[in-house]
Interface confidence: medium
Amino acid sequence: APISSHCRLDKSNFQQPYITNRTFMLAKEASLADNNTDVRLIGEKLFHGVSMSERCYLMKQVLNFTLEEVLFPQSDRFQPYMQEVVPFLARLSNRLSTCHIEGDDLHIQRNVQKLKDTVKKLGESGEIKAIGELDLLFMSLRNACI
């Protein structure tokens, strides 16, 4: 299996009750506006064929996409949560900037691309869905990167 380097986040990032709550509240607000409950972005299909030792790298890719293609364009919505959560997630992204995989990551990129394609295909409702799954993104980062 490919070797992942520097794919670690300190536990303290996930031990801040206030920002944890704000992240989950943002997800809740967005999920209330999500009518497409049959589609799941962060779930079994995303993780398929990706070992846990590669999972943090996978979630880094999802985090970066979510920030750049979803949260920044939608930054005026779901206030006041968005203005607090986006900088927090951006800090996590920055801390994972040196996380990479030595070797073939095609299987990971393929899974991430499917997530990206789904969001793009759904348009704005895809972006809302991605925000509604920030709780899953948060939990997956915690599960994989500590």
């Epitope: 536990k11 996930f14 009750p17 944890t20 709550n21 989950f24 509240m25 997800a27 809740k28 999920s31 409950t37 799941r40 962060i42 779930g43 079994e44 995303l46 993780f47 070992s51 846990m52 030792s53 999972r55 709780d135 899953l136 939990m139 997956s140 915690r142 599960n143 994989a144 500590i146």
Partner: antibody, heavy 121, light 110 residues
Framework: EVQLVESGGGVVRPGGSLRLSCAAS????????MNWVRQAPGKGLEWVSG????????DYAASVKGRFTISRDNAKNSLYLQMNSLRAEDTALYYC??????????????WGRGTLVTVSS | QAVLTQPSSVSGSPGQSITISCTGA?????????VSWYQQHPGKTPKLIIY???KRPSGVSNRFSGSKSSNTASLTISGLQAEDESDYYC??????????FGGGTKVTVL
Amino acid sequence: EVQLVESGGGVVRPGGSLRLSCAASGFTFDDYGMNWVRQAPGKGLEWVSGVNWNGGTRDYAASVKGRFTISRDNAKNSLYLQMNSLRAEDTALYYCARGWYSGAAWNMGYWGRGTLVTVSS
Amino acid sequence: QAVLTQPSSVSGSPGQSITISCTGASGDVGAYNFVSWYQQHPGKTPKLIIYDVNKRPSGVSNRFSGSKSSNTASLTISGLQAEDESDYYCSSYTSTFSVVFGGGTKVTVL
């Protein structure tokens, strides 16, 4: 076939200790978060503790925090629960449970048959 | 004690539909889509029948369906059958990284 086999239960006096083990087979153990769930005789299910794939995060129910310690040995495909300062209310059947898919340990899709812990003087 | 509230018993005739409620708080069921449902026959181990509010594991009958509204999750069993007589438990993941269960509901097929 996924198999989870618990062991280590028994009768212990209040204040005593026990160490439960769960031997896992039939899947890539270090791809999954794991949990301990207990069920007192004739009662409902109570989550006790959970651990992520590499032991980096360990979470506990308030009722056992500071007394119980969850750990895992991926080389041995084993999950453990060290139980100290045991109380009568800890008497239960203790289940080892695995997540349904590896990204979410809280969806407990596979369960062992349990090991019985009795705390009595 | 159980953190999520379920009715202690629900009954129905064969072929009917029944719904079991699971009421929590804004910190668990209300906030996140991490609700699971388990079936437990007497003397047997629990079986996951619904996860992430409304997803069914492979092999679970499509007669079982899950939903959620505000702080209450629901499990519906349609076309009730004799083998559905069992205890049912809901659970939810929380933002404090713990799992909470309901007290369980005994389903009786009349």
